[in-house]
């Protein structure tokens, strides 16, 4: 087969700009070019054939990879029909999973669907687009290509492109995509973003307020911790790190470190500025009087694990 405008090259892969309105190539031919450049007519699968799960060996057909069925290979087959799959299988279906192919990442622009061919890929372009990758637009403003109230500029003649100026909340070359404004994560401090179409709303977590949950209602500003305590922010609330001997939300409550009777075996507890101190009864030792002292002078410390000497610091669980 020979190339037809507007593609050039030995495989009709390079495009040339048509002098007038773009010509429609015959079915099964890529948009192509001068007669001296020869190319093979690529395999064009059935329109709509799934680029991921379908392929063709004859023009127009849509043959399904294992695990898929339907006219366009869009329907997963139940695992019962994949009892003895050949090749790598999917854990979810038990069916053959195709490896990476030329359509991975979808090389077709402007909403074109990609079909694998024996040598490369083929793009099935939506109406108004053509070219190897559907990158050339044959649409003008007269066709009304801008959706959702987009303003069309340019494109007075078939060879010139058009540009859609999209209204707020829409994007894409044809303003066809609603902007997911919440993907920009405008709500601070863990607020929940709600796109209402006409506006964004942030649903704030407890302790935060403002249009973007930017105000911390429970912050340390204007909040003093009593008795030398230090204010610490975090987790949508504030807390006070209290000085020794004080406790409570604002460190206003006097705390007695000896109230919990931390000294064992009758040891006496004394509150001290650096913490509590235990005065142990005769025959006991340790920070909390927890270890009995043996008459021969050896203490009943637990045996040290391998690699530690008995005198080394240890943590006992």
């Amino acid at each position: 087969a020979r190339c037809e405008p507007p593609a050039v090259g030995t495989a009709c892969t390079r495009l040339c700009r048509p002098r007038s309105a773009p010509s429609r190539c015959g079915p099964g031919l890529r948009p192509c070019a001068p007669l001296e450049d020869e190319c093979e007519a690529p395999l064009v699968c059935r329109a709509g054939c799934s680029p991921e799960h379908g392929f063709c060996e004859q023009p127009g057909e849509c043959r399904c990879l294992e695990g898929w069925t339907g006219p366009l290979c869009t329907v997963p087959v139940s695992t019962s029909s994949c009892l003895s799959p050949r090749g790598p299988s999917s854990a979810t279906t038990g069916c053959l999973v195709p490896g990476p192919g030329p359509c991975d990442g979808n090389p077709c622009a402007n909403g074109g669907s990609c079909s694998e061919t024996p040598r490369s890929f083929e793009c099935t372009c939506p109406r108004g687009f053509y070219g190897l990758r559907c990158e050339v637009s044959g649409v003008t403003c007269a066709d009304g290509p801008c959706f959702n109230g987009g303003l069309c500029v340019g494109g007075a003649d078939p060879d010139s492109a058009y540009i859609c100026h999209c209204p707020p909340g829409f994007q894409g070359s044809n303003c066809e995509k609603r902007v997911d404004r919440c993907s920009l994560q405008p709500c601070r401090n863990g607020g929940l973003c709600l796109d209402l179409g006409h506006a964004l709303r942030c649903r704030c977590r407890a302790g935060f307020a403002g249009p973007r949950c930017e105000h911390d209602l429970d912050d340390c500003a204007g909040r003093a911790c009593a008795n030398g305590g230090t204010c610490v922010e975090g987790g949508g609330a504030h807390r006070c790190s209290c000085a020794l001997g004080f406790g409570g939300r604002d460190c206003r409550e006097r705390a007695d470190p000896c109230a919990a009777r931390p000294c064992a075996h009758g040891g006496r507890c004394y509150a001290h500025f650096s913490g509590l101190v235990c005065a142990c009864a005769p025959g006991y030792m340790g920070a909390r009087c927890e270890f009995p002292v043996h008459p021969d002078g050896a203490s009943a410390l637990p045996a040290a694990p391998p690699g530690l000497r008995p005198g080394d610091p240890q943590r006992y669980l």
């Epitope: 015959g26 099964g28 329109a47 127009g60 069925t69 869009t74």
Partner: antibody
């Protein structure tokens, strides 16, 4: 442009067979599915099946297996549907249609063939 | 088989109105749905493919929407030539199936 020209209507006897033709023009006949659709008053549209002329591969609606069979002659760009063992239930308009080139579905239709089965 | 249900057999409208024809699939068909218009004594005419794309030459007052199981054909600014029967079709699964049709009539 794409054209599908169907054969004329037939009055058939019960038990007989009829072969409807669909001649295509304006495109590469081999490369696109020819679809066959039945329409009876009050029954809407029913898909009978399809044939890809280039490979001869066919897919039938289970409901019409044994009733309809498809063939295609690429030299004359003509698709055929044969209906066998006709009954009054087969009285209907039968359409051929072509699958789209870039867009899925049936953008091109023949004018229809009326088959009437009557004793 | 997938059943395409067009719950309204008839719909009354006036010229200039906006009317929506609905179609419900018995299971998920993605966007593999087409809409056709048929006038008495004529072959069906393709309007919409892939649920929301107009076939070439179809006026832009016809718009399609939906995915999964619920689909709608909307005709804004109805013209007298739009009075016809409308069929939806799924081509996601074999066998391909059509809805029973919705006839658009004048009030």
């Amino acid at each position: 442009q794409v054209q599908l020209q169907q054969s004329g209507g037939d009055l058939m006897k019960p038990g007989a067979s009829v072969k409807i033709s669909c001649k295509a023009a304006g495109y590469t006949f081999s490369n696109y599915y020819i679809e066959w659709v039945k329409q009876r008053p009050g029954h809407g549209l029913e898909w009978i099946g399809e044939i890809l002329p280039g490979s001869g591969s066919t897919t039938y609606n289970e409901k019409f297996k044994g009733k309809a069979s498809f063939t295609a002659d690429t030299s004359s760009n003509t698709a055929y549907m044969q209906l066998s063992s006709l009954t009054s239930e087969d009285s209907a308009v039968y359409y051929c249609a072509r699958w789209g080139a870039r867009e899925p579905g049936f953008p091109y239709w023949g004018q229809g063939t009326l088959v009437t089965v009557s004793a | 088989d997938i059943v395409m249900t067009q719950s309204q057999k008839f719909m009354s409208t006036s010229v200039g109105d906006r009317v929506s024809v609905t179609c419900k699939a018995s299971q998920n068909v993605g966007t593999n749905v087409a809409w056709y218009q048929q006038k008495p004594g004529q072959s069906p005419k393709a309007l919409i493919y892939s649920a929301s794309y107009r076939y070439s030459g179809v006026p832009d007052r016809f718009t399609g929407s939906g995915s999964g199981t619920d689909f709608t054909l909307t005709i804004s600014n109805v013209q007298s030539e739009d009075l016809a029967e409308y069929f939806c079709q799924q081509y996601n699964n074999y066998p391909l199936t059509f809805g029973a049709g919705t006839k658009l009539e004048l009030k």
